[in-house]
C-alpha cells in the first residue's frame, strides 16, 4: 500500500461480534449490484488478533493448499509465503501444485517498516468460506522478507483488494478481485465487517476469536443497522475518498478541507490506526486533549507509544470525545458523517505486568502520506466497496463496540459546498506514488 508507515497490517482488532443488534431502519439507498440479503456462508469468515490484521482462509493450487491470508484494501498484490520462515507454520509449496505456472518474473515490495520479494506465477485459488468458485489468479510467491510476517499472527500471505494501478511490479499485473470478477459471474462488489475486540484478548481467546466478515459479491443486511451512505471513489488506485469536514465532539476543526486529504484519503483494512496528515493530527490531538482534560495523559500516550490503564471495567469512556469525519456524498453539495467512539480509537492491549487492568493505546497517529481510515475507523462500520458503481458505503456495524450512552453513527445528509476543492491533486512530477510503506 502506498504506505506512509504501514506494515503488513497495522492493527486490526479482532474478536467476537459484540454489541447489540439495533432495530433495522428502512433502506433508502438505490438498488445495489450483486446479491442482496443473506450470505450465510461468508459471515464470520474473518479472524485476527489485535493489531495484527484480519485474515480469511484461502486455498491455492492443486491439490488445494490452505493458507490464512490478510485482507488488505490498501494494496493490490496477492502474495503468499512460499519458503520456510521462522514465523510461518505453513507456506505455499509451488512444486506440489500441478496447476502452478511460473511467470518468470520477480517482484519487490517495500513498506516503510517491512519488505518482501518473490516470484510471480499463477495458480488456482478459492475461498472456502466465500463464493463457490475457483479462479486462476496472479500470485507473488514470497521467497525473502524482512519485518513483514508477524510472529504469532496466524496469517501467511496478503490479499491486496485495491486496484491494478498500485500493483507491483506494475499495473499490468491483474489483482485477485479483478480476476475473480472477470472469470465468474460474481458482481464487482465486496463488503467488510471488521469486529474489534473491545477488550484485551489473551493468547487463547485471540486465536479462537471471530474477527468479522468479508462478503464477496454483495451486501449482507444482518451485518449493519440503519442505512448505507455512499461516498464516491475519487480515483481507482487505492480506495481514495474525500473528507470534507472533521469534528471532535461536534466541534469543527475548521481547517481548509484540502488538509484532510493531503495527499490523499484512503480506506485501508491493512492499517491499524486512523492516520491523519501532520497538521490535522496536531489539531485533532489538541482538541481531543481538551475534551478529555479531566484526566491527564503523558505525551507518549498521544504519540501511540505509551499505554494508559484503568482498573478492570472502569475505563472512563465518557471523558473521551467522539470523532466525526464528513465524507463527500453522492449528490452535489451533499455530505454525510461517520462518527467513531473512543471504543474504536483507544485500542485494547494486554499489559503483562498489570493483567487485572484494562490497558489501551491511542490509535490515532500521524501520517506523511495522507489520511488512512484503518481498522480503527472500519471497526465501527460495515463498509461496502462497490467497485461497480465506484463508491464506498458506510453503515453502523452490528458488531461495533459501544456503551449504553453512545454508539457509532452514520448520519446525513448535510449541505456542504465546493467539496471538489477538498481533493488534493498530486503533481504529475511527484514520484512519491512509486514508494510503498505503511503502518
Amino acid at each position: 500500500t502506498h504506505l506512509g508507515i504501514r506494515l503488513p497490517l497495522r492493527s486490526g482488532l479482532a474478536g467476537p461480534p459484540l454489541g447489540l443488534r439495533l432495530p433495522r431502519e428502512t433502506d433508502e439507498e438505490s438498488e445495489e449490484p450483486g446479491r442482496r440479503g443473506s450470505f450465510v456462508e461468508m459471515v464470520d469468515n474473518l479472524r485476527g488478533k489485535s493489531g495484527q490484521g484480519y485474515y480469511v482462509e484461502m486455498t491455492v493450487g492443486s491439490p488445494p493448499q490452505t493458507l490464512n491470508i490478510l485482507v488488505d484494501t490498501g494494496s493490490s498484490n496477492f502474495a503468499v509465503g512460499a519458503a520456510p520462515h521462522p514465523f510461518l507454520h505453513r507456506y505455499y509449496q509451488r512444486q506440489l501444485s500441478s496447476t502452478y505456472r511460473d511467470l518468470r518474473k520477480g517482484v519487490y515490495v517495500p513498506y516503510t517498516q517491512g519488505k518482501w520479494e518473490g516470484e510471480l506465477g499463477t495458480d488456482l485459488v478459492s475461498i472456502p468460506h466465500g463464493p463457490n468458485v475457483t479462479v486462476r489468479a496472479n500470485i507473488a510467491a514470497i521467497t525473502e522478507s524482512d519485518k513483514f510476517f508477524i510472529n504469532g499472527s496466524n496469517w501467511e500471505g496478503i490479499l491486496g483488494l485495491a486496484y491494478a494501478e498500485i500493483a507491483r511490479p506494475d499495473d499490468s499485473l491483474e489483482p485477485f478481485f479483478d480476476s475473480l470478477v472477470k472469470q465468474t459471474h460474481i458482481p464487482n462488489i465486496f463488503s467488510l465487517q471488521l469486529c474489534g475486540a473491545g477488550f484485551p484478548l489473551n493468547q487463547t481467546e485471540a486465536l479462537a476469536s471471530v474477527g468479522g466478515s468479508m462478503i464477496i459479491g454483495g451486501i449482507d443486511h444482518s451485518l449493519y443497522t440503519g442505512r448505507l451512505w455512499y461516498t464516491p471513489i475519487r480515483r481507482e488506485w487505492y480506495y481514495e475518498v474525500i473528507i470534507v469536514r472533521v469534528e471532535i465532539n461536534g466541534q469543527d476543526l475548521k481547517m481548509d478541507c484540502k488538509e484532510y486529504n493531503y495527499d490523499k484519503s484512503i480506506v485501508d483494512s491493512g492499517t491499524t490506526n486512523l492516520r491523519l496528515p501532520k497538521k490535522v493530527f496536531e489539531a485533532a490531538v489538541k482538541s481531543i486533549k481538551a475534551a478529555s482534560s479531566t484526566e491527564k495523559f503523558p505525551d507518549g500516550f498521544w504519540l501511540g507509544e505509551q499505554l494508559v490503564c484503568w482498573q478492570a471495567g472502569t475505563t472512563p469512556w465518557n471523558i473521551f470525545p467522539v470523532i466525526s469525519l464528513y465524507l463527500m456524498g453522492e449528490v452535489t453539495n451533499q455530505s454525510f458523517r461517520i462518527t467513531i467512539l473512543p471504543q474504536q480509537y483507544l485500542r485494547p492491549v494486554e499489559d503483562v505486568a498489570t493483567s487485572q487492568d484494562d490497558c489501551y493505546k491511542f490509535a490515532v497517529s500521524q501520517s506523511s502520506t495522507g489520511t488512512v481510515m484503518g481498522a480503527v475507523i472500519m471497526e465501527g462500520f460495515y463498509v461496502v466497496f462497490d467497485r461497480a458503481r465506484k463508491r464506498i458505503g458506510f453503515a453502523v456495524s452490528a458488531c461495533h463496540v459501544h456503551d449504553e450512552f453512545r454508539t457509532a453513527a452514520v448520519e446525513g445528509p448535510f449541505v456542504t459546498a465546493d467539496m471538489e476543492d477538498c481533493g488534493y491533486n498530486i503533481p504529475q512530477t511527484d514520484e512519491s506514488t512509486l514508494m510503498t510503506g505503511r503502518a
Epitope: P84, K105, G106, Y108, E144
Partner: antibody, heavy 124, light 107 residues
Framework: EVQLLESGGGLVQPGGSLRLSCAAS????????MSWVRQAPGKGLEWVSA????????YYADSVKGRFTISRDNSKNTLYLQMDSLRAEDTAVYYC?????????????????WGQGTLVTVSS | EIVLTQSPATLSLSPGERATLSCRAS??????LAWYQQKPGQAPRLLIY???NRATGIPARFSGSGSGTDFTLTISSLEPEDFAVYYC?????????FGGGTKVEIK
C-alpha cells in the same frame, strides 16, 4: 574495501564435476545477494545463477538448470557453485559478483563489484 | 527469454567525440536495465543501473536513458580510458540476459 576471490576452476572432462568458491571480504556477506556470471573465451557475458542474501531464493539460467547448484555459507563469507554434468559449452571464465542489497529485485540492487574470475575448461 | 540486441556491434570514434550505444529488448523490461563496461583482461564494472542512474564513482559524461524496450547509453565526450566493450543487461524476467555487447574502439 570489498574483495571477491574466485577459486576452484581448472580442467575437467565432459560429464565431470567442479565446485567453485568465492571468498568475500570487506562487507557483511549475509546482507547481500550474490551472483555467478560467465564469459566464454572471446564471447560476451552470460548470467548463470543468483541467490538472495539469506540463500532462501536461488535462480538459474535455463542452460545450467538441473546441473549447477548455487549455495552460500554466510558464516564462512563464501559463495559456491557446484557444477555437475559439465559440457564443453560450459568452458568460460566464471565471475562472482556482489548484489546491491539482500534483495534480488529491489531497484538499484545490481551486481557490482565482480571478482577477477576463475577459468573452467571442459575438454577431453 | 528476453533477447537484448545491442547496436552497433562496433563503434569507431576518436577521443572527445560523443558515443551513442543502443540496446533494444524483445519485450518490455520497464527500467530494469543496467550497463556494464569491460576492458580486456578485467572484470565488468557497473556504469548505469535502473536505466538512467549513474553508479557510484562513475563520471558524469556517462548517461543512460530509455524505458520499456529501447535504451541508450551516451558518453558525451570520449576519454582514452572509455574505449572498451559495453554490455546491457536486464533483470525484469528470468533468465536475466545480457546483450551481445558494443565495442567502442579508437578510430
Amino acid at each position: 574495501e570489498v574483495q571477491l576471490l574466485e577459486s576452484g576452476g581448472g580442467l575437467v572432462q565432459p560429464g565431470g564435476s567442479l565446485r567453485l568458491s568465492c571468498a568475500a571480504s570487506g562487507f557483511t556477506f549475509g546482507s547481500y545477494a550474490m551472483s555467478w556470471v560467465r564469459q566464454a573465451p572471446g564471447k560476451g557475458l552470460e548470467w548463470v545463477s543468483a541467490t538472495s542474501g539469506s540463500g532462501g531464493s536461488t535462480y538459474y539460467a535455463d542452460s545450467v538448470k538441473g546441473r549447477f547448484t548455487i549455495s552460500r555459507d554466510n558464516s564462512k563469507n563464501t559463495l559456491y557453485l557446484q557444477m555437475d554434468s559439465l559440457r564443453a559449452e560450459d568452458t568460460a571464465v566464471y565471475y562472482c559478483a556482489k548484489g546491491g542489497s539482500q534483495w534480488l529485485y529491489a531497484p538499484g540492487s545490481w551486481f557490482d563489484p565482480w571478482g577477477q574470475g576463475t577459468l573452467v575448461t571442459v575438454s577431453s | 527469454e528476453i533477447v537484448l540486441t545491442q547496436s552497433p556491434a562496433t563503434l569507431s570514434l576518436s577521443p572527445g567525440e560523443r558515443a551513442t550505444l543502443s540496446c533494444r529488448a524483445s519485450q518490455s523490461v520497464s527500467s530494469y536495465l543496467a550497463w556494464y563496461q569491460q576492458k580486456p583482461g578485467q572484470a565488468p564494472r557497473l556504469l548505469i543501473y535502473d536505466a538512467s542512474n549513474r553508479a557510484t564513482g562513475i563520471p558524469a559524461r556517462f548517461s543512460g536513458s530509455g524505458s520499456g524496450t529501447d535504451f541508450t547509453l551516451t558518453i558525451s565526450s570520449l576519454e582514452p580510458e572509455d574505449f572498451a566493450v559495453y554490455y546491457c543487461v536486464q533483470r525484469s524476467n528470468f533468465p536475466w540476459t545480457f546483450g551481445g555487447g558494443t565495442k567502442v574502439e579508437i578510430k
